[in-house]
């Protein structure tokens, strides 16, 4: 059975539907069972903090990135680390906290409509989940200029949020990552916690917009940990 929460990344003011589902023989669908969806009860609470091992940034929360815990440390041992705030040093976009991106080695605000007018950007990109390339090093990829004539609209396939138009972020939608709207005040968000069981979120939501954070909805404080509803709220 699909032992997960079937919620989507579309922005809704209602809680995601709970419960499992399965594609049984003879039913009308062919299902992909057992995939970890966001918002489920498989995350540990922050009190049970454990360094979460990872292979890529995507396996970490929105406020985290995947890296070796020590500078020049064993590349084979990577964990989810807290994202870098504005003006902190970085090597790639994922290291910077939501709402920021990495420019010239420093996390800067993405409100400045970066990349507009820039025809090409050279990025460091690694292949696959194992971060390996044919020669064992990250390769430098120059993105073709056509990608930057127009920024991706909602639904456009992307690799990073900088591929998307203003007000959109790049979030997984199973087959690929696509541009989705950044969440507004009152909209349901996914509170990323350490994963208790390994699995990718295949239907991700964007992060909350500027000035908002993902917090437990006030009238849900009494609910059990697993069913607490998080919404984007003013700081």
């Amino acid at each position: 059975t699909l032992n997960s929460v079937l919620n989507s990344n579309a922005i809704k003011n209602l809680p995601p539907p709970l419960g499992g589902a399965a594609g049984h023989p003879g039913s009308a669908v062919s299902a992909a069972p057992g995939i970890l969806y966001p918002g489920g009860n498989k995350y540990q609470t922050i009190d049970n903090y454990q360094p979460y091992p990872c292979a890529e940034d995507e396996e970490c929360g929105t406020d985290e990135y995947c890296a070796s815990p020590t500078r020049g440390g064993d590349a084979g041992v990577q964990i989810c680390l807290a994202c870098r705030k504005r003006r902190k040093r970085c090597m790639r976009h994922a290291m910077c906290c939501p709402g920021n991106y990495c420019k010239n080695g420093i996390c800067v605000s993405s409100d400045q409509n970066h990349f507009r007018g820039e025809i090409e950007e050279t990025i460091t990109e690694s292949f696959g989940n194992d971060h390996s390339t044919l020669d064992g090093y990250s390769r430098r990829t120059t993105l073709s200029s056509k990608m930057y004539h127009t920024k991706g609209q909602e639904g456009s396939v992307c690799l990073r949020s900088s591929d998307c138009a203003s007000g959109l972020c790049c979030a997984r939608h199973f087959w690929s990552k696509i541009c989705k709207p950044v969440l507004k005040e009152g909209q349901v968000c996914t509170k990323h916690r350490r994963k208790g069981s390994h699995g990718l979120e295949i239907f991700q939501r964007c992060y909350c917009g500027e000035g908002l954070s993902c917090r437990i909805q006030k009238d849900h404080h009494q609910a059990s940990n697993s069913s607490r509803l998080h919404t984007c709220q003013r700081h």
Partner: antibody
Framework: EVQLVQSGAEVKKPGASVKVSCKAS????????IHWVRQAPGQGLEWMGW????????TYAQKFQARVTMSRDTSSSTAYMELSRLESDDTAMYFC?????WGKGTMVTVSS | QAVLTQPSSVSGAPGQRVSISCTGS?????????VHWYQQLPGTAPRLLIY???NRPSGVPDRFSGSKSGTSASLVIAGLQAEDEADYYC???????????FGTGTKLTVL
């Protein structure tokens, strides 16, 4: 339980149009995209395009751009794929997919 | 010319290990787009075997594994069983076509 139930098999003449439906249930229809994929007898899978169930925005594979129209009716949680100017090599099984769930397929036969 | 190329057929005896390759280019697999693998039994819809390069849905035996490196991906089936006889397809996205693409498909025969 998530279900994608497709309409029944169709037999069409060359030059005609066919409209295949895909009724979704068990989830919030407007939260997901519906893709259409076809498979000619003995051949591989071929992506035709998608529709955003909420906005109705569509993206079509270039091959089908001039002949395909994808639409949806949110009130009945149903997606539609219409293919016009049918030719014999459009004979195929047409699947709708929510990416993680697939319909069972609709067989469309084009024959004079 | 197919975008994602797979061997048209592979075969193996029960218990053996087989590998199915999926070769793409710098505009699909090599551009860091994810690869998914499907199994299709005759007359049925495709069934997801591996998602996002190397993740296995529950219900899929751990005999199936996926990997991705450079411009290609592989599906490995260890300990072949008779019920594995089916067609297998890889899938990714291609930014030059602005389209999702499937591999040419591989027919697996269990001898």
């Amino acid at each position: 339980e998530v279900q994608l139930v497709q309409s029944g098999a169709e037999v069409k003449k060359p030059g005609a149009s066919v409209k295949v439906s895909c009724k979704a249930s068990g989830y919030t229809f407007t939260d997901y995209y519906i893709h259409w994929v076809r498979q000619a007898p003995g051949q591989g899978l071929e992506w035709m395009g998608w529709i955003h169930s909420n906005s109705g925005a569509t993206t079509y594979a270039q091959k089908f751009q001039a002949r395909v129209t994808m639409s949806r009716d949110t009130s009945s949680s149903t997606a539609y794929m219409e293919l016009s100017r049918l030719e014999s090599d459009d004979t195929a099984m047409y699947f709708c997919s929510r990416e993680d769930y697939w319909g069972k397929g609709t067989m469309v036969t084009v024959s004079s | 010319q197919a975008v994602l190329t797979q061997p048209s057929s592979v075969s193996g005896a029960p218990g053996q290990r087989v590998s199915i390759s999926c070769t793409g280019s710098s505009s699909n697999i090599g551009a860091a787009y994810d690869v998914h693998w499907y199994q299709q039994l005759p007359g049925t819809a495709p069934r997801l075997l591996i998602y996002v390069n190397n993740n296995r849905p529950s219900g899929v035996p751990d005999r199936f594994s996926g990997s991705k490196s450079g411009t290609s991906a592989s599906l490995v089936i260890a300990g072949l069983q008779a019920e594995d006889e089916a067609d297998y397809y890889c899938q990714s996205y291609d930014n030059s076509l602005n389209a999702y693409v499937f591999g040419t498909g591989t027919k697996l025969t269990v001898l």
